[in-house]
C-alpha cells in the first residue's frame, strides 16, 4: 500500500502568509509574487549574480515536529544559466545548499548559522537559459531530501544563497506513515514510518470482526518501512464459522447456506435432507428421520439407516451353508454399508433355540462384513439354523430399529468326512477320516465302499463305528476308487468324495506309508 | 478601505528634527514590511528606508543613514519615521508605501504624501 | 545601480507607445512600474513577469529582455498623460531597490 504523507510546511499553499526570515534582510532572498491563471503564485528569489560573496540566508519559520522521526523535503525550484549573465559572471553559482536545525524552542528573529547542519547541495537537472526565461518558459526542478532521526520538538529549514540565480517555488515538508491497512481480513493501525532505512517497524495487526487467526497459523503481522509502505505479510485471519468474506470484512452466512470451520472457503448450501438454517448457521440441522454421523463433515447431506438387505438365500451343502445376499434398496444415502450376520439354532425335537455362535465356523469374521456372501460350516446335522443378516451404515447407531432379513436352513445330513490314505502295499491300503466333533455323536457307523477303477459292476462295503480301515486282498498295483459315508438313525449322511488310492506294485513291496 | 494616511510634514530649519507619522487600515498592518519614499520638488522618486513586518530589520538609503530613523507600532497600526539634522537637500514630499510581499515590494499602496520643506 | 528611463516620450491617442528601462539589475531581477498623475501619490501598474494589480486597465503590459524593461500602453488615451517610473530590486547590493529617472508620456 502506497505510504500516507502527514504535510508539516507547504510554502506554495501557503499564499506568502509564511513570513520565512531572510538574512541579510531585503538584499539576498526575497519573496516575490507573479500572477498565473488570475492565481497569485509565490516564491522566494535571489539574483545577486553579479556581486561576489554572497551569503543569503532564508530560514523558515519554526516546524513542529510532532510525530515525525525523519522528514522529506520536496523542493520545486528555478536556477536561470550563469552564462545568462556577461561574462558568464565569474562569481554566479547555479547551486544553493540546504541546512537544517532542531530545536525544542522558536528562536523568532534570532538567527544563527552555527547551529545549522547541511543537508546537500541542491543543484538543478535543468537551468533556464535566458532565451528560455524571456519566452516565460523556465524550467522547473524537483529535487527531494529526507533527515532523520529527529528527536527535538521542532525544527528549521534554511536556505544558503552563494551567489546563484535561483526561485524557490515549493517547498514541502512532509513525514511518512504506513496508512492504515485492511488486508488478510486483519487491521492494522496507521503507523508512522521509521527513521532508518532499513530498519521494518513490525506492526501487530488485529482481526477484523468475526475473522480468527486459524488454529496452528500465525498471528497478522506487517512490516512498516521508511518510505510509509507496508511489507511483508505475516500470517492472517479467517472469517469464522458462520461468516465468509466479502471484500475486507466477514459477513454472516445467509439464510440456507452455512459454514461449519474457520476457513477462506465461503458458506455452502445447506445439503440434502437438512432444515433450512438461520443467517450465520455454523452448520444445517438434519430433517427428521435423517442424522449425521460424528466424523460426517458438514457439508456433507443427511444420511438415514439403510433399509434390510434386499434378497437374501441360504443354500445347504451338507453341514455347510452359503449365505448370499444383495445390497439394500435404500443405502439411506450413504456408501458405508456393512453388513452383521447372526446365527440361531434350533432343536426339532423340543423346538428350543439358542445363539450358534460359538459353534459354529465362518468364512471371514460375521460382522461388519463389507461383502455380500458368506459361508458357515460346521453345522450339525438335523437341526434347523436362523440366519439373519443386518445392514448397517454410519449412522445406524443413532436409531434404535434395526433393518435385516432372515433365512432359515434345515440341516439334514452331517457333513462329508475327509478322508485320507495313511498306508499302502501291494495288496491293502489303509484309510482315514474325519468329521467335524459336534456331528461325531449323531453318527452310528461308518460305511466305506470301494471298487477296482473302470470296474463299474462290482464293488465292496465295509462298516465300522471306528475314523480307519485297512482294506485287505486288493490286487497289486492297481487303482481303487474310496468313499466314506456316515450313517446316522436318520439315515444316511453325506458321502466324502470319491478318492483314487493305488496298491503298491510287487517290486516296491512292504507297508509303506504315503 | 485599505489606505494609508499620513501626517506630521511641515516646514523645519536646517538641522532640525521633524516626526512623520502613516496611518494604515483596511488590512493587517503587522504582516507587511512597509517603506518611506521620496520626491524632491520636480524630480523623481528616491527610495529612503524600509522596515520588516515584526520591526527586526531596517534599512536605508546611504543619504539618510545615521540621520533617519524609520520604525513603527503594530498595535497602533503606524509607520514612522523620526527626521533629525535635517538638511535643504532632504525637502521632498514623503511618501509611505506597503511592499506587497517581501522585503522590496512592488508598492502597492501608498500615502497621500506630506511635505517637509528644510530651509532657513 | 541604477536605472535610465527616457525624459519623455509622446503618442498620439489611440496609439501604442512603450517606455524603456534600462540597468543591471533587470538581468536578476523583474520591474515594476508606477503612474504618477501631478499632485497625487505613485499608482503601482504592472509588476513580476507582467502582472497587473486589479483596476488597471489591460491596455498597460510589461515585458523584459536582457538589462531591459518595458512598459507597452496599447491604444493610449488622454487620461494615461503621467510621470511613469520603473522600479527594481538592486542585484548589486549596494541599495535595497531603484527606482529609474521617471519619464514624462504626453498624448498628444
Known amino acids: 500500500a502506497q505510504g500516507k504523507e502527514v504535510v508539516l510546511l507547504d510554502f506554495a499553499a501557503a499564499g506568502g502568509e509564511l513570513g520565512w526570515l531572510t538574512h541579510p534582510y531585503g538584499k539576498g532572498w526575497d519573496l516575490m509574487q507573479n500572477i498565473m491563471n488570475d492565481m497569485p503564485i509565490y516564491m522566494y528569489s535571489v539574483c545577486n549574480v553579479m556581486s561576489g560573496d554572497q551569503d543569503n540566508w532564508l530560514r523558515t519559520n519554526w516546524v513542529y515536529r510532532g510525530e515525525a522521526e525523519r522528514i522529506f523535503i520536496e523542493l520545486k525550484f528555478t536556477v536561470r544559466d550563469c552564462n545568462s549573465f556577461p561574462g558568464g559572471a565569474s562569481s554566479c553559482k547555479e547551486t544553493f545548499n540546504l541546512y537544517y536545525a532542531e530545536s525544542d524552542l522558536d528562536y523568532g528573529t534570532n538567527f544563527q548559522k552555527r547551529l545549522f547542519t547541511k543537508i546537500d547541495t541542491i543543484a538543478p537537472d535543468e537551468i533556464t537559459v535566458s532565451s528560455d526565461f524571456e519566452a516565460r518558459h523556465v524550467k522547473l526542478n524537483v529535487e527531494e531530501r529526507s533527515v532523520g532521526p529527529l528527536t527535538r520538538k521542532g525544527f528549521y529549514l534554511a536556505f544558503q544563497d552563494i551567489g546563484a540565480c535561483v526561485a524557490l517555488l515549493s517547498v514541502r515538508v512532509y513525514y511518512k506513515k504506513c496508512p492504515e491497512l485492511l488486508q488478510g481480513l486483519a487491521h492494522f493501525p496507521e503507523t508512522i514510518a521509521g527513521s532508518d532505512a532499513p530498519s521494518l517497524a513490525t506492526v501487530a495487526g488485529t482481526c477484523v470482526d468475526h475473522a480468527v487467526v486459524p488454529p496452528g497459523g500465525e498471528e497478522p503481522r506487517m512490516h512498516c518501512a521508511v518510505d510509509g509502505e507496508w511489507l511483508v505479510p505475516i500470517g492472517q485471519c479467517l472469517c469464522q464459522a458462520g461468516y465468509e468474506k466479502v471484500e475486507d470484512a466477514c459477513q454472516a452466512c445467509s439464510p440456507g447456506f452455512f459454514k461449519f470451520e474457520a476457513s477462506e472457503s465461503p458458506c455452502l448450501e445447506c445439503p440434502e435432507h437438512t432444515l433450512p438454517s438461520p443467517e450465520g448457521a455454523t452448520s444445517c440441522e438434519c430433517e427428521e428421520g435423517f442424522f449425521r454421523a460424528p466424523q460426517d463433515p458438514a457439508s456433507m447431506p443427511c444420511t438415514r439407516p439403510p433399509s434390510a438387505p434386499h434378497y437374501l438365500t441360504a443354500v445347504g451343502m451338507g453341514a455347510k451353508v452359503e449365505l448370499r445376499w444383495t445390497p439394500p434398496q435404500d443405502s439411506g444415502g450413504r456408501e458405508d454399508i456393512v453388513y452383521s450376520v447372526t446365527c440361531e439354532q434350533c432343536w426339532p425335537e423340543s423346538g428350543e433355540c439358542g445363539p450358534c455362535e460359538a459353534s459354529v465356523r465362518y468364512s471371514e469374521p460375521p460382522h461388519g462384513l463389507t461383502r455380500t456372501s458368506v459361508t458357515v460350516s460346521d453345522l450339525e446335522p438335523h437341526m434347523n439354523y436362523t440366519f439373519t443378516v443386518e445392514a448397517r451404515n454410519g449412522v445406524s447407531g443413532l436409531v434404535t430399529s434395526r433393518s435385516f432379513r432372515t433365512a432359515s436352513v434345515s440341516i439334514n445330513q452331517t457333513e462329508p468326512p475327509k478322508v485320507r490314505l495313511e498306508g499302502r502295499s501291494t495288496t491293502s491300503l489303509s484309510v482315514s477320516w474325519s468329521i467335524p466333533p459336534p456331528q461325531q455323536s449323531r453318527v452310528w457307523k461308518y460305511e466305506v465302499t470301494y471298487r477296482k477303477k473302470g470296474d463299474s459292476n462290482s464293488y465292496n462295503v465295509r462298516r465300522t463305528e471306528g475314523f480307519s480301515v485297512t482294506l485287505d486282498d486288493l490286487a497289486p498295483d492297481t487303482t481303487y476308487l474310496v468313499q466314506v459315508q456316515a450313517l446316522t438313525q436318520e439315515g444316511q449322511g453325506a458321502g466324502s468324495k470319491v478318492h483314487e488310492f493305488q496298491t503298491l506294485s510287487p517290486e516296491g513291496s512292504g507297508n509303506l506309508a504315503v | 478601505q485599505v489606505q494609508l494616511v499620513q501626517s506630521g510634514g511641515g516646514l523645519v530649519q536646517p538641522g532640525g528634527s521633524l516626526r512623520l507619522s502613516c496611518a494604515a487600515s483596511g488590512f493587517t498592518f503587522s504582516s507587511y514590511a512597509m517603506h518611506w519614499v521620496r520626491q524632491a520638488p520636480g524630480k523623481g522618486l528616491e527610495w529612503v528606508a524600509v522596515?520588516?513586518?515584526?520591526?527586526?530589520?531596517?534599512y536605508y538609503a546611504d543619504s539618510v543613514k545615521g540621520r533617519f530613523t524609520i520604525s513603527r507600532d503594530n498595535s497602533k497600526n503606524t509607520l514612522y519615521l523620526q527626521m533629525n539634522s535635517l538638511r535643504a537637500e532632504d525637502t521632498a514630499v514623503y511618501y509611505c508605501?506597503?511592499?506587497?510581499?517581501?522585503?522590496?515590494?512592488?508598492?502597492?499602496?501608498w500615502g497621500q504624501g506630506t511635505l517637509v520643506t528644510v530651509s532657513s | 545601480s541604477e536605472l535610465t528611463q527616457p525624459p519623455s516620450v509622446s503618442v498620439a491617442p489611440g496609439q501604442t507607445v512603450t517606455i524603456t528601462c534600462q540597468g543591471d539589475?533587470?538581468?536578476?531581477?523583474?520591474a515594476s512600474w508606477y503612474q504618477q498623475k501631478p499632485g497625487t501619490a505613485p499608482k503601482l501598474l504592472i509588476y513580476?513577469?507582467?502582472n497587473r494589480p486589479s483596476g488597471v486597465p489591460d491596455r498597460f503590459s510589461g515585458s523584459s529582455s536582457g538589462t531591459s524593461a518595458s512598459l507597452t500602453i496599447t491604444g493610449a488615451q488622454a487620461e494615461d498623460e503621467a510621470d511613469y517610473y520603473c522600479n527594481s530590486r538592486d542585484s548589486s547590493g549596494t541599495h535595497l531597490t531603484v527606482f529609474g529617472g521617471g519619464t514624462k508620456l504626453t498624448v498628444l
Open positions: 508605501a506597503r511592499a506587497s510581499v517581501g522585503a522590496t515590494g512592488p508598492f502597492d499602496i
Open positions: 513580476g513577469e507582467n
Open positions: 539589475s533587470l538581468r536578476s531581477y523583474y
Open positions: 522596515i520588516s513586518y515584526d520591526g527586526s530589520n531596517k
